[in-house]
């Protein structure tokens, strides 16, 4: 019973992590710069993301520009893009592996095989969490290094954007969820599959509610 509950919690956390990761990768808020001129009229905020940059004027008007050439982009930005996409795909793969081994599915009948699949999915989610963490920490490190570099001009200095915090949250949720799935797999078990089917059916809607907790309209 506890094992099933931990599995549900684990997969819900990883789904929330995946959604967080998706939002983090998509939003142009990795680096934030505030340019304040002599007059408040020219005050503007620049948001930089993996795919585009946006300028928000003091009037509230926002203009976004998608980065043109892939080859012209800095290597660290290309790497961050790649890692973000890979992390999301790896997490999706983890979800498929989990679904194949979940106690409420009939893809695999044998209990040991199911347990192994759930364990594998947990490991895959942990890997996804680590992959999410790398570009976020790398970008944060660069921002902090610039902040303390006396030869980097004030206008070139950035602040940590909301996407980085979302990325850390995503990584944490994927690591925690994956860890829980790894912990719920002692081989063998006395409960029958029908028992869990009932438990899962009542919990299923909770999964679909996860993403709505992050209102992306606030960010874009």
């Amino acid at each position: 019973m506890a094992s099933a509950g931990m599995q549900i919690l684990g997969v819900v956390l990883t789904l929330l992590g995946w959604v967080n990761g998706l939002v983090s990768c998509a939003l142009p808020m990795w680096k934030v710069t505030a340019f304040i001129g002599n007059s408040i009229v020219v005050a503007q905020v620049v948001w930089e993301g993996l795919w585009m940059s946006c300028v928000v004027q003091s009037t509230g008007q926002m203009q976004c520009k998608v980065y043109d050439s892939l080859l012209a982009l800095p290597q660290d930005l290309q790497a961050a893009r790649a890692l973000c996409v890979i992390a999301l795909l790896v997490a999706l793969f983890g979800l498929l592996v989990y679904l194949a081994g979940a106690k409420c599915t009939t893809c695999v009948e044998e209990k040991d095989s199911k347990a192994r699949l759930v364990l594998t999915s947990g490991i895959v989610f942990v890997i996804s969490g680590v992959l999410t963490l790398i570009p976020v920490c790398w970008t944060a490190h660069a921002i902090i290094r610039d902040f303390y570099n006396p030869l980097v001009a004030e206008a070139q200095k950035r602040e940590l954007g909301a996407s980085l915090y979302l990325g850390w949250a995503a990584s944490g949720l994927l690591l925690l969820g994956g860890g829980l799935l790894c912990c719920t797999c002692p081989s063998g078990g006395s409960q029958g599959p029908s028992h869990y089917m009932a438990r899962y059916s009542t919990s299923a809607p909770a999964i679909s509610r996860g993403p709505s907790e992050y209102p992306t309209k606030n960010y874009v």
């Epitope: 660069a142 570099n149 006396p150 030869l151 001009a153 206008a155 070139q156």
Partner: antibody, heavy 119, light 107 residues
């Protein structure tokens, strides 16, 4: 117009001390990072020291750490470089430099003051 | 310490020609590189920062580029007033170091 005028250079014996000054004018001194860079007789440029706008943080290369001290007086719009335990390899033209809000690196250079360490 | 290897040490070209000065960092410095110009008897002047960005007032015939740890300063349509020493400098981490300089002359 940004103006940086260095003074205090001269001939000094090895092991001796010297204090360089840099008088800044034409801009508000407080908000800017300031540095000293020297140019050896062989025309090589060497970064000497940097001080943050408030003066709270200072940055030195190992070659001068413990021997040179940078300071600033924001009220007097003046930058200082106290040099002690001078060596012959410290012989150089010393430039006072101001950073910039928009540009990275050493944005504005003074005309320099010559320091000669010799017996 | 990060070493900056600048080449060539000296360069002679005709007015109107295109010249390129290169600078290689001994390790990764991202785009934390500046170029300076020093005319005879004068102090150095900042030309380029962040490896590619030109300082206001610098003629557009000057351009900076980066490929990994190799950086270049290109001068298109060389003018007589471009006669000077050119230095690269990294500001990735302390200590900040300069290249040995390139002396540019007109033929």
């Amino acid at each position: 117009e940004v103006k940086l005028v260095e003074s205090g250079g001269g001939l000094v014996k090895p092991g001796g001390s010297l204090k360089l000054s840099c008088a800044a004018s034409g801009f508000t001194f407080n908000p800017y990072t300031m540095s000293w860079v020297r140019q050896t007789p062989a025309k090589r440029l060497e970064w000497v020291v940097t001080i943050s706008s408030g003066g709270g943080r200072t940055y030195y290369p190992d070659s001068v750490k413990g021997r040179f001290t940078i300071s600033r007086d924001n009220a007097r719009n003046t930058l200082y470089l106290q040099m002690s335990s001078l060596r012959s390899e410290d012989t150089a033209m010393y430039y006072c430099i101001r950073g910039d809000y928009r540009y990275d690196g050493f944005a504005y250079w003074g005309q320099g003051t010559l320091v000669t360490v010799s017996t | 310490d990060i070493q900056m290897t600048q080449s060539p040490a000296s360069l002679s070209a005709s007015v109107g020609e295109t010249v390129t000065i290169t600078c290689r960092a001994s390790e990764n410095i991202d785009s934390y590189l500046a170029w300076y110009q020093q005319k005879q008897g004068k102090s150095p002047q900042l030309l380029v920062y962040a490896s590619t960005l030109l300082v206001d007032g610098v003629p557009s015939r000057f351009s900076g580029s980066r490929s990994g740890t190799q950086f270049s300063l290109k001068i298109n349509s060389l003018q007589s007033e471009d006669v000077a020493r050119y230095y690269c400098q990294h500001y990735y981490s302390i200590p900040y170091t300069f290249g040995s300089g390139t002396k540019l002359e007109i033929k």
